[in-house]
């Protein structure tokens, strides 16, 4: 009755700070327009990282944001936040809206758990 | 703050047309479909139909198929409702709202009579 | 017009608790979500309860609802003086190809 979303429990950023992971929905079939947001939980607080409508027909890449990238394929979205700092270390929540046509469906993922780990500054050198 | 404004009921003959406009505001217009919900006098809300975030494609319930024209200006953030051959079983207040139904606007009155 | 069918009233004192109900069919309730919407006299609906089950933004955990077989029921707990308002229910048809929607129930508060 519900829609469920998966993604992969824990994500390692690379030393750029660079995280991707795949959010997997269970597609009713007919949708047209999916909306993918990401939301970023920090205690009980959600805050929305980025969001995009897209047109599954396209397989596009779909966010268009200075955070977040993206491209789709079927009922899969690859999703890639850039410019993550050691303090963005934190549950990042794959958020799936049917958007048309109807029926209207949501459906969220538990999270991924983004660990990044601040570069080392490099010696200085004479 | 998301905010939809309908504008444009009024008294119409039957066989008449009128014009509904919804004006949005407080959130990305233009990624999100829309419906447009009617509630008659002492009676409970009915999907009049809906349009996809691009203007491409839309939908409509069987009561006003061939009747209805839902369309949408993004540049302007509005959706439309064109009613042609109204009726009296028309009369209702006017909704529109988000395709995910988070946010409704305040409603228009259209009465359809002689 | 209403698929759905719900008590046209209910009434109750405040802080008491009050449920409504909302009976459909195997096409709707029994297949599909219900939504809850709360409509302020002259105003338009607003959505209490998500298509996932889940409290819309900004409403009280008052506010909760449950489903058995074909019938979704709305419980609002310790009854408050802005509660009194109409209460919709919606579902999808998977017959009729759309979202049907309750006659709508009227909360009185004593």
């Known amino acids: 009755k519900g829609m469920h979303a998966a993604q992969p429990a824990v994500v390692l950023a690379s030393s750029r700070g660079v995280a991707s992971f795949v959010c997997e929905y269970g597609s009713s079939g007919n949708a047209a327009e999916v909306r993918v947001t990401m939301l970023r939980q920090a205690g009980s607080q959600m805050t929305e990282v980025c969001a995009a409508t897209y047109t599954v027909e396209d397989e596009l890449a779909f966010l268009d944001d200075s955070t977040c990238t993206g491209t789709s394929s079927g009922n899969k979205v690859n999703l890639t936040i850039q410019g993550l700092r050691a303090m963005g270390t934190g549950l990042y929540i794959c958020k799936v809206e049917l958007m048309y046509p109807p029926p209207y469906y949501v459906g969220m993922g538990n999270g991924t758990q983004i660990y990044v780990i601040d570069p080392e500054p490099c010696p200085d050198s004479d | 703050e998301v905010q939809l404004v309908e504008t444009g009921g009024d008294l119409v003959k039957p066989g008449g047309s009128l014009r509904l406009s919804c004006v949005a505001s407080g959130f990305s217009f233009s990624s999100y479909a829309m419906n447009w919900v009617r509630q008659a006098p002492e009676k409970g809300l009915q999907l009049v139909g809906g349009i996809n975030s691009g203007g491409s494609s839309t939908y409509y319930t069987d009561a006003v198929k061939g009747r209805f024209t839902i369309s949408r200006d993004n540049a302007k953030n509005t959706v439309y409702l064109q009613m042609n051959s109204l009726r009296a079983e028309d009369t209702a207040v006017y909704y529109c709202?988000?395709?995910?139904?988070?946010?409704w606007g305040q409603g228009t009155l259209v009465t359809v009579s002689s | 017009q209403a698929v759905l069918n719900q008590p046209a009233s209910v009434s109750g004192s405040l802080g008491q608790r009050v449920t409504i109900s909302c009976t459909g069919s195997s096409s709707d309730i029994g297949k599909s979500y219900v939504a809850w919407y709360q409509q302020l006299p002259g105003t338009g609906p607003r959505t209490l309860i998500n298509v996932d089950g889940n409290r819309a933004s900004g409403v009280p955990d008052r506010f909760s609802v449950s489903r058995s077989g074909n019938t979704a029921t709305l419980t609002i707990s310790g009854l408050q003086a802005e509660d009194e308002a109409d209460y919709h229910c919606s579902s999808w048809d998977w017959s009729l190809h759309t979202y049907v929607f309750g006659s709508g129930t009227q909360l009185t508060i004593l």
């Open positions: 709202a988000i395709s995910n139904w988070a946010y």
